[in-house]
């Protein structure tokens, strides 16, 4: 008598998540009498997937009528496939008995599930950095299968090359995650810049997913300070200007000191934006020269975005009062990022 064969024609089947998977199985003979069962996996840990005789398998339906006389097709359809359904499925013939005895197994069909990656999430550094510094951006996407995936980084449309990407886990899995870290060198012009992480996968039909991050969240552009004196007014009042330019973010506090004593403190708010996304701010201080016997040392002190204060000092000469004082007569500088003013 011809030996019974259990034929699983497909070595592997690939299905998109949410779709149905058909697992084919035919037997070469009607004898011996006994049921067919479907298992995922082999050995003692295998899971029963379908047993016509008993059990409740709501997502599994036979492709042909298993109760029909002379039926030799025991293919099944599994609906609403998820990545957790991946594995090797075996069609197994049993000989009728008490209990039924396993007779022969098919060679197995490996079911792989194609699952889309989640929308990439890009996160930037926890603290801001200044121009010429390198900051790291991380892009993460999860839940995709198969493992093959392409990730690219762009800054303002230009592809970046300094990045490192890992796909986990390293071995076979029902689904995978990707994590990539890109290193970006900041420039003062990057307030309006954007980094984009682009993920391409077979499930996306050539339409990659993108995640973005604004460099405005990562950059600090420190201000330039300039202190100047306008011409002395007829009432012996000197108008001293502190120009704070090209800074980002807007969070800034300016303090005027007269001979080391706080004269006035101002907070920047609702400033107009420059084309490059930075801000400018100008503060004025009127000094009554006739109220002072000695020279007045004025200091414009700027605290930007929680950083150490930057000072610019300026001395107003009181000893001689020329009627027109169109230019600075003397200046002192302390602190960082300072220039002499003459």
């Amino acid at each position: 008598e011809e030996e019974l064969q259990v034929i699983q024609p497909e070595k592997s089947v690939s299905v998109a998540a949410g779709d149905s998977a058909t697992l084919n199985c035919t037997v070469s003979s009607l004898i011996p009498v006994g049921p067919i069962q479907w298992f995922r996996g082999a050995g003692p840990g295998r899971e029963l997937i379908y047993n016509l005789k008993e059990g409740h398998f709501p997502r599994v339906t036979p492709v042909s009528d298993p109760t029909k006389r002379n039926n030799m097709d025991f293919s099944i359809r599994i609906s609403n496939i998820t990545p957790a359904d991946a594995g090797t499925y075996y069609c197994v013939k049993f000989r009728k008995g008490s209990p039924d005895v396993e007779l022969k197994s098919g060679a197995g069909t490996e079911l792989s599930v194609r699952a889309k990656p989640s929308a990439p999430v890009v996160s930037g550094p926890a603290v801001r950095a200044t121009a010429e510094h390198t900051v790291s951006f991380t892009c993460e996407s999860h839940g995709f299968s198969p493992r093959d995936i392409t990730l690219k980084w762009f800054k303002n449309g230009n592809e970046l090359s300094d990045f490192q990407t890992n796909v986990d886990p390293a071995g076979k899995s029902v689904s995978y995650s990707i994590r990539s870290t890109a290193r970006v060198v900041l420039t003062r012009r990057d307030v309006h810049s954007q980094v984009i992480c682009e993920v391409a996968h077979v499930t996306l039909q050539g339409d990659p997913l993108r995640g973005t991050a604004n460099l405005s969240e990562a950059i600090r552009v420190p201000p330039f300070l300039e202190v100047t004196q306008q011409s002395m007014r007829a009432d012996n009042q000197v108008n001293v200007t502190c120009q704070v330019t090209k800074f980002y973010p807007q969070r800034l506090q300016l303090t005027w000191l007269e001979n080391g004593n706080v004269s006035r403190t101002e907070m920047a708010s609702a400033l107009p934006e420059n084309k490059d996304g930075t801000y400018n701010w100008t503060s004025w201080l009127l000094v009554n020269v006739s109220a002072h016997r000695d020279d007045v040392k004025l200091t414009c002190q700027v605290e930007h975005d929680g950083q150490p204060a930057v000072n610019k000092s300026f001395s107003v000469k009181v000893s001689a009062h020329p009627k027109e004082q169109g230019s600075n007569t003397a200046a002192e500088n302390t602190g960082t990022n300072e220039r002499n003013i003459y």
């Epitope: 050995g43 003692p44 396993e102 022969k104 197995g108």
Partner: antibody, heavy 122, light 112 residues
Framework: QVQLQESGPGLVRPSETLSLTCTVS????????WSWIRQPPGKGLEWIGF???????FYNSSLKSRVTISLDMSMNQFSLKMTSVTAADTAVYYC????????????????WGQGTTVTVSS | DIVMTQSPLSLPVTPGEPASISCKSS???????????LDWYLQRPGQSPQLLIY???NRASGVPDRFSGSGSGTDFTLKISRVEAEDVGVFYC?????????FGGGTKVEIK
């Protein structure tokens, strides 16, 4: 080429818990059983238990009450925990891969770690 | 549990000569699907065991053809057609039909 590497403390105090990890490199955890086997000094091999990639565990009945095997697919690792150890648990502990291709049984323990010596002593 | 019994305990051999090891199980390892769930392993001195034969008679990848497995049900034999010096070590049979998996006590093969 699949390789297995056991790691864990070489000395465990009596009544404490023995914890070992096996790292799988160069291959997949899927579709295999992952086994722990031990060999007391100068003696034969004793099967402790195994875990299938789907998380189902099987233990030697003589050790079942003290043993837990777990699997971390994301790290490509599986672990053994054995509680209330005594000097009789002193052995070389091997982790190994067991094949299963069809049917109810197993098709050979084809990859073994190099083994790690665990001594139970105070 | 299935009990595995190996004989002899020790086997002195001459290089180039054949050798044979017996393994008996307390119940049949022949399953209804036609497979005998019995493996043979060799543990060389200071090394981990290595798989030689699986499912009773199938040679594992990379195993020389001088090793062969035979038998069915409860009686199994491992034959080495021509012993070589590298074959010294302890040979174990193991049943893989049901848990707990159980090993024979081992047969120590040494050169005369």
């Amino acid at each position: 080429q699949v390789q297995l590497q056991e790691s864990g403390p070489g000395l465990v105090r009596p009544s404490e818990t023995l914890s070992l990890t096996c790292t799988v490199s160069g291959g997949s955890i899927r579709n295999y059983y992952w086994s722990w086997i031990r060999q007391p000094p100068g003696k034969g091999l004793e099967w402790i238990g195994f875990i299938y990639y789907n998380g189902r565990t099987f233990y030697n009945s003589s050790l079942k009450s003290r043993v837990t095997i777990s699997l971390d697919m994301s790290m490509n690792q599986f672990s053994l925990k054995m509680t209330s150890v005594t000097a009789a648990d002193t052995a070389v502990y091997y982790c190994a891969r067991v094949r299963a291709y069809s049917g109810i049984g197993l098709d050979g323990t084809d990859v073994w770690g190099q083994g790690t010596t665990v001594t139970v002593s105070s | 549990d299935i009990v595995m019994t190996q004989s002899p305990l020790s086997l002195p051999v001459t290089p180039g000569e054949p050798a044979s090891i017996s393994c008996k199980s307390s119940q049949s390892l022949l399953y209804s699907n036609g497979y005998n769930y019995l493996d043979w392993y060799l543990q060389r001195p200071g090394q981990s065991p290595q798989l030689l034969i699986y499912l009773g008679s199938n040679r594992a990848s990379g195993v020389p053809d001088r090793f062969s497995g035979s038998g069915s049900g409860t009686d199994f034999t491992l034959k080495i057609s021509r012993v070589e010096a590298e074959d010294v070590g302890v040979f174990y049979c193991m049943q893989a039909l049901q848990t707990p998996l159980t090993f024979g006590g081992g047969t120590k093969v040494e050169i005369k």
